[in-house]
Structures are given as structure tokens and as C-alpha cells.
């Protein structure tokens, strides 16, 4: 995990200023409004049952 201004986060992750660490882009499916998701490629929508079980 990197501080801002150093090497970028590893592939598949993005820096979260809110959490002060690199976060997995995969979690943007569950938490799409997280700040780090702006640095991730558009996440696919969650399966129907995850959003509205």
C-alpha cells in the first residue's frame, strides 16, 4: 500500500484518500460510491440477487 505521490497502487486496485490505502477495484461492485472507484475502470453491475435479494 502506497502513500499518495509514490508508486501507484498495484493492478486492480486504486488509492482511497478516505481510507488512506489502496483498495481493490473488485469491491466497487458492492461499494460503487467509494472514492477509490473513480480510479477504477467501470465496474460491472452487481448480480440481481446481490442488490435486491
Amino acid at each position: 500500500e502506497q502513500a499518495p505521490g509514490t508508486a501507484p497502487c498495484s493492478r486492480g486496485s486504486s488509492w482511497s484518500a478516505d481510507l488512506d490505502k489502496c483498495m481493490d477495484c473488485a469491491s466497487c461492485r458492492a461499494r460503487p460510491h467509494s472514492d477509490f472507484c473513480l480510479g477504477c475502470a467501470a465496474a460491472p453491475p452487481a448480480p440481481f440477487r446481490l442488490l435486491w435479494p
Epitope: 473488485a26 458492492a30 440477487r49 446481490l50
Partner: antibody, heavy 119, light 111 residues
């Protein structure tokens, strides 16, 4: 240091009720999805219930086996998680873990509290 | 519900060798980009501990001797080189949909 501490387990008769509590510290409780997971020799690890965030209107989800019987709730002001369990049966016996995750995984686990349903 | 089947149920590995644990899902838990599979370690008398999330991503503080791979329905946890402290039961867990489910566990013994 992250800490989750469950309480409220014990012995209860079939058909009885019990409320489990979990107090959290060391992380931003109100930004974490919280769940209860049960472990028993018969069924292994079973996810039971989840409660999301205030921004999700505290959406709750349940395993089919506990739907209508168990109710999960949280109090962000006290960093507490609860599980109200009604109409308990022998198959509800097990170790109940309070767990927290930023998203759809379980980052943090308590040590567990044991519930025994028996006459 | 998605059923996760782990194999083997138990295995014994010599110190310093490789342990390989498999988890098969009854349906795909992957998109084109990500796989929604986690791995946990549970030592006797302790709660489970997150090792790997989203199939390949090590949780913070987890030693690099642990690695995860796979996509779709077939996933693998590798431990190499195995150390004595790795003696534990390992579980997979999917987060593709609700209900989340766990595998039945694989007990790893070290000789």
C-alpha cells in the same frame, strides 16, 4: 487494534429467544458492512445475516434458514451489532461470530460466543 | 444457493513443501474482470482470518507464501513454502450473490 467482542450466548431451551451483542473498536464501524456467521460441526461455517450502512438505509439480508426468525440490527453511535434470535431450535446451536467487512468479504472476526439450544 | 466444494478434505505436507487446496463452485462467480472468491485460515480455537479476497488479492499482513488463483468455477489456494504455523483449516467463501456460502474446509497438517 481491531477488536470485535461478542456476548449473550449461553444455554436456551428449544422455542426460546436470545439476543447476541457485539461491540467493535479499532476501525470505523459505521463504514463497514456487518454480519453474523455461525459455525457448527454439522454445518461448518454459515453466513446468517448482514446489515449495510446508513447510506444504504441499513439494508439487511438473511440466509433463508433464519429469515423471519432472526433480526440483525446495529447502533453506529455505540459501535454495536445485534442479533435477535427467536423460536430457537437444536440446529441453531453453534459458535456465533460477529464479522465486519468493507464490502462483500469478512475482514474482521470476533472470538465468537457459544449458543446451546437444549432442554 | 451456490455450493462450494473443497478438496481434499485433509492433507499432510512436509515442512517447506507446497500445499495446494482446491475450491469448486456450482456456478461461475466471476465477471470478465474479477472473481468473487475469498480464502480464510482458521487455527484451532481461533476465529477464521481473511487471507485472500477476490481470488488473488492478499489481505494486508498475509505472508507472500500464500497465493490464490482461478476464475469461473475453479479456484486454488497455494502455500509455499509451508511453515509449521500454517497448520490450520482453510475455507473458501464466495460473494457472488446472497446468500454468501463457505466451503466445507480443508485441514492442513504439517510433518
Amino acid at each position: 487494534e481491531v477488536k470485535l467482542e461478542e456476548s449473550g450466548g449461553g444455554l436456551v431451551q428449544p422455542g426460546g429467544s436470545m439476543k447476541l451483542s457485539c461491540v467493535a473498536s479499532g476501525f470505523t464501524f459505521n463504514n463497514y458492512w456487518m454480519s453474523w456467521v455461525r459455525q457448527s460441526p454439522e454445518k461448518g461455517l454459515e453466513w446468517l445475516a448482514e446489515i449495510r450502512l446508513k447510506s444504504d438505509n441499513y439494508a439487511t439480508h438473511y440466509a433463508e434458514s433464519v429469515k423471519g426468525k432472526f433480526t440483525i440490527s446495529r447502533d453506529d453511535s455505540k459501535s454495536r451489532l445485534y442479533l435477535q434470535m427467536n423460536n430457537l431450535r437444536a440446529e441453531n446451536t453453534g459458535i456465533y461470530y460477529c464479522t465486519g467487512g468493507f464490502a462483500d468479504y469478512f475482514d474482521y472476526w470476533g472470538q465468537g460466543t457459544t449458543l446451546t439450544v437444549s432442554s | 444457493d451456490i455450493v462450494l466444494t473443497q478438496s481434499p478434505a485433509s492433507l499432510t505436507v512436509s515442512l517447506g513443501q507446497r500445499a495446494t487446496i482446491s475450491c469448486r463452485a456450482s456456478q461461475s462467480v466471476s465477471t470478465s474482470s474479477y472473481s468473487y472468491m475469498q480464502w480464510y485460515q482458521q487455527r484451532p480455537g481461533q476465529p477464521p482470518k481473511l487471507l485472500i479476497k477476490y481470488a488473488t488479492n492478499l489481505d494486508s499482513g498475509v505472508p507472500a507464501r500464500f497465493s490464490g488463483s482461478g476464475s469461473g468455477t475453479d479456484f486454488t489456494l497455494n502455500i509455499h513454502p509451508v511453515e509449521e504455523e500454517d497448520a490450520a483449516t482453510y475455507y473458501c467463501q464466495h460473494s457472488w450473490e446472497i446468500p454468501y456460502t463457505f466451503g466445507g474446509g480443508t485441514k492442513l497438517e504439517i510433518k
